[in-house]
């Protein structure tokens, strides 16, 4: 077809942004392009074209009229991770194409199993006590907190230090005795370890 004076090649006017999304949640990678004729939009991940509902009606990815890529739910398994990666949108018309900036889609995960559960500890009053846990693997890396007898531990107590997976009580009191649980938390949620008992013996 003949080049019309008012026609112009595509340009990306809204680029996709990096995302961290929880598995199973919906997500959108935005892309908006201008051009005349109106450009068609396709998405690519790691150099491969991304299939959407336009290719397969059962797909969990939808190409929205705006050109954005909508995920009905982020799919992410122990091995197959079809949604994670670096995406670009490409806008095309007969005058050329425009490629968006890269946008990484990362999947937030928090596994169920603690790599190390805390163990029971028995100390005499006034002695230090240490409990240690390693939370489940997660992305973003889970933060660690502790509960005692079902309530968050008062880490404002200067005797108590939480560093990495270690809970340290510099000198124990009788009142420190109880059931302790390590808690790993990130944007996915939280996981609780098995219970460990701290027994504080009278001297």
């Amino acid at each position: 077809s003949r080049l019309r004076q008012e026609d112009f090649p595509p340009r990306i006017v809204e680029h996709p942004s990096d995302l961290i999304v929880s598995k199973g949640e919906p997500a959108t990678l935005n892309c908006k392009a201008e051009g005349r004729p109106t450009p068609t939009i396709e998405w690519y991940k790691g150099g491969e074209r991304v299939e959407t509902d336009k290719d397969d009606p059962r797909s969990h990815r939808m190409l929205l009229p705006s050109g954005s890529l909508f995920f009905l739910r982020i799919v992410h398994g122990r091995r197959s991770k079809p949604d994670e990666g670096v995406y670009v949108c490409v806008a095309r018309n007969y005058l050329g194409e425009a490629v968006s900036h890269n946008a990484s889609l990362e999947v937030a995960i928090l596994r169920d199993d603690f790599r190390q559960n805390p163990s029971d500890v028995m100390v005499a009053v006034g002695e230090p006590a240490v409990m240690e846990c390693q939370p489940p693997r997660g992305h973003p890396e889970p933060t660690i907190s502790w509960k005692k007898d079902g309530s968050p531990l008062d880490d404002k107590d200067e005797r108590i230090t939480i560093r990495g997976g270690k809970l340290m009580i510099t000198y124990t009191r009788k009142s420190d005795a109880g059931k302790y649980v390590c808690v790993g938390t990130n944007m996915v949620g939280e996981r609780e370890s098995e219970v460990a008992e701290l027994t504080v013996l009278e001297r």
Partner: antibody, heavy 118, light 105 residues
Framework: EVQLVQSGAEVKKPGASVKVSCKAS????????MHWVRQAPGQGLEWMGW????????EFPQKFQGRVTMTRDTSITTAYMDLSRLRSDDTAVYYC???????????WGQGTMVTVSS | DIVMTQSPSSLSASVGDRVTITCRAS??????LNWYQQKPGKAPKLLIY???SLQSGVPSRFSGSGSGTDFTLTISSLQPEDFATYYC???????FGGGTKVEIK
């Protein structure tokens, strides 16, 4: 349409090797692990291993280590399973299967019958 | 290695019956358990993933339950097309159960 199409039936002599292909279409080949499963006549399903098409990484159960090789050609979205030093008890239907992001084999090839006979 | 034990290995049932198949793992696999149906001469078909999630396009008469080591596949009202062999699979180490053949009584 998402599908896996496997190569045709093979007849091999004991001690020989067989290479079965599995052509993937309708989805991003590098996004999903590919597994191989076999089924001897009248028997159950036996997992043989996986390949990550993205980087070619593989894993096999102890039973098949040293005898099975899994490869892929991303340019033609095809996975391959090579089984060497064939024995009569390797006679089976060999399936490729895609592992979904839900940790299950959601798409299967039609199967390839491999007969090992002298 | 995680060993999957399915029971029974075979059962006879009539159309309309409620059928239950069990699968036991030799160690805890959380909810990493799938169920497949296979008909003679055909590839297996995914029915249930993650112990209880129904695969798209699978009739709602199929359901799965359980976690840890004990799992169940239930067919609420057996239909003629359900006579087949059923396999459980754990998706941690990927081994299959031995199968349960559902035959016509």
């Amino acid at each position: 349409e998402v599908q896996l199409v496997q190569s045709g039936a093979e007849v091999k002599k004991p001690g020989a090797s067989v290479k079965v292909s599995c052509k993937a279409s309708g989805y991003t080949f590098t996004g999903y692990y590919m597994h191989w499963v076999r089924q001897a006549p009248g028997q159950g399903l036996e997992w043989m291993g996986w390949i990550n098409p993205k980087d070619g990484d593989t894993e096999f159960p102890q039973k098949f280590q040293g005898r099975v090789t899994m490869t892929r050609d991303t340019s033609i979205t095809t996975a391959y399973m090579d089984l060497s030093r064939l024995r009569s008890d390797d006679t089976a239907v060999y399936y490729c299967a895609r592992e979904s992001g839900d940790d299950a084999f959601d798409i299967w090839g039609q199967g390839t019958m491999v007969t090992v006979s002298s | 290695d995680i060993v999957m034990t399915q029971s029974p290995s075979s059962l006879s049932a009539s159309v309309g019956d409620r059928v239950t198949i069990t699968c036991r793992a030799s160690q805890s696999i959380s909810s990493y358990l799938n169920w497949y149906q296979q008909k003679p001469g055909k590839a297996p078909k995914l029915l249930i993933y993650a112990a209880s999630s129904l695969q798209s396009g699978v009739p709602s008469r199929f359901s799965g339950s359980g976690s840890g080591t004990d799992f169940t596949l239930t067919i609420s009202s057996l239909q003629p097309e359900d006579f087949a062999t059923y396999y459980c699979q754990q998706s941690v180490g990927l081994s299959f159960g031995g199968g349960t053949k559902v035959e016509i009584k």
